[in-house]
């Protein structure tokens, strides 16, 4: 598979915001890429999200994404919003190279985010 | 060495308190341990807290200790308060047998912590 | 247009070699990884080898069935993918096709193994 | 190794079926799956990449689907010209095994 490199591990900031880059190593030269981000947890595999996008162009996510990236070359920087406690997991970074043919797949070994739900502040009265 | 184990990565509440358990396979019958918290960070390697104690009896720290404990048996539930994000690292347990002879030391592989600092609450006006 | 030609098939006889030639043309030859794959009655298709491309190293990869016996080279300066196979058996028959990436194929080269 | 499992080695249908033929994969391969077409004296041709992208002239009556360890082809309203050996590959890692085929009779 073509690699795929992301950072082990992440740390969603306290608003629940979590950003990492997803670099891939392209053996030839694509003009539409296809990014998307799986949630492993408990062997179950999960789409987070999915953008195509043609290479100089921006990423376009669906409005109702919790995702939102950009890209620069061969490296997609990616930002996850919303994220609870409870969607702690590894989250795999999953790239295509869909046009001009051959397809090229590859998939990262997955940034484990970890997930801290904040205190809620004290009642202003 | 005397093996101790203790758990790869714990996530620090928002409240920026850590708590793991320090476990160690003794080869006798001793009436007196000591058990440090070290972290390595950057190569560097600190010393966070330590307290001896006799089987049976309390984990006692030193009043200004940012560390609390209980033991039982040959188990020790550490509690680490007051970290930042700056203090994520990875916390070591080391295990000293003190008495009665031989003297037996036990090193684990460390606990990384992962703090992450909480957004300011609005001010109250 | 793109052109995939295998030269190089034949009748050989068990444990003699024989070296398969593959001419790329009509895409960008060294941006492509080229595999080999060959199709029999008995097995239908069979994936047998991968070189990769520069970026890569040029790293290659084998199937079990092969490993060891059959090697696979490329020349980007000649558009060419090469597959050299020692040591063939009567289970090596079929038709070898070389194709980038499985995205373009050729027209095959039938390899006939027999005393 | 991934072992692919495909299914049913054969199948007969009339012209404007529907039909649909199914591969399973020991592991999850991450939608890394192709399908061909091959016809009798012909090269395979590459006819679904990705699971479920329709490659470039091929008729979309033609469509892939699924994820995971479950994959399928589905060719709507058959024709003569659909006659073929079609295989799945998958397209994740070494080695790139094909599964063993179903043969399509109309």
């Known amino acids: 598979a073509m690699h795929v490199a992301q950072p082990a591990v992440v740390l969603a900031s306290s608003r629940g915001i979590a950003s990492f880059v997803c670099e891939y190593a392209s053996p030839g030269k694509a003009t539409e890429v296809r990014v998307t981000v799986l949630r492993q947890a408990d062997s179950q595999v999960t789409e987070v999200c999915a953008a195509t996008y043609m290479m100089g162009n921006e990423l376009t996510f669906l409005d109702d994404s919790i995702c939102t990236g950009t890209s620069s070359g061969n490296q997609v920087n990616l930002t996850i919003q919303g994220l609870r406690a409870m969607d702690t997991g590894l989250y795999i970074c999953k790239v295509e190279l869909m046009y001009p043919p051959p397809y090229y797949l590859g998939i990262g070994n997955g940034t484990q985010i970890y997930v801290i739900d904040p205190e809620p502040c004290p009642d202003s009265d | 060495a005397m093996h101790v184990a203790q758990p790869a990565v714990v996530l620090a509440s928002s409240r920026g308190i850590a708590s793991f358990v320090c476990e160690y396979a003794s080869p006798g019958k001793a009436t007196e341990v000591r058990v440090t918290v070290l972290r390595q960070a950057d190569s560097q390697v600190t010393e966070v807290c330590a307290a001896t104690y006799m089987m049976g009896n309390e984990l006692t720290f030193l009043d200004d200790s940012i560390c609390t404990g209980t033991s039982s048996g040959n188990q020790v539930n550490l509690t680490i308060q007051g970290l930042r994000a700056m203090d994520t690292g990875l916390y070591i347990c080391k295990v000293e047998l003190m008495y009665p002879p031989p003297y037996y030391l036990g090193i684990g592989n460390g606990t990384q912590i992962y703090v992450i600092d909480p957004e300011p609450c609005p001010d109250s006006d | 247009e793109v052109k995939l030609d295998e030269t190089g098939g034949g009748l050989v006889q068990p444990g003699r070699p024989m070296k398969l030639s593959c001419v790329a043309s009509?895409?960008?030859?060294?941006?492509?990884?080229m595999n080999w794959v060959r199709q029999s009655p008995e097995k239908g298709l069979e994936w047998l080898a991968q070189i990769r491309n520069k970026p890569y190293n040029y790293e290659t990869y084998y199937s079990d069935s092969v490993k060891g016996r059959f090697t696979i080279s490329r020349d980007d300066s000649k558009s060419s993918v090469y597959l050299q196979m020692n040591n063939l058996r009567g289970e090596d028959m079929g038709i070898y096709y070389c194709?980038?990436?499985?995205?373009?194929w050729g027209q095959g080269t039938l390899v006939t193994v027999s005393a | 190794d991934i072992q692919m499992t495909q299914s049913p080695a054969s199948l007969s249908a009339s012209v404007g079926e529907t039909v649909t033929i199914t591969c399973g994969t020991s592991e999850n391969i991450y939608g890394g799956l192709n399908w061909y077409q091959r016809k009798q004296g012909k090269s395979p041709q590459l006819l679904i990449f990705?699971?479920?992208n329709l490659a470039d002239g091929m008729s979309s009556r033609f469509s892939g689907s699924g994820s995971g360890r479950q994959y399928s082809l589905k060719i709507s309203s058959l024709h003569p010209d659909d006659v073929a050996t079609y295989y799945c590959?998958?397209?994740?890692?070494?080695?790139?095994?094909f599964g063993s085929g179903t043969k399509l009779e109309i």
């Open positions: 990705g699971a479920t």
């Open positions: 194709t980038a990436q499985f995205a373009y």
């Open positions: 590959q998958n397209v994740l890692r070494s080695p790139f095994t």
């Open positions: 009509g895409f960008t030859f060294s941006d492509n990884w």
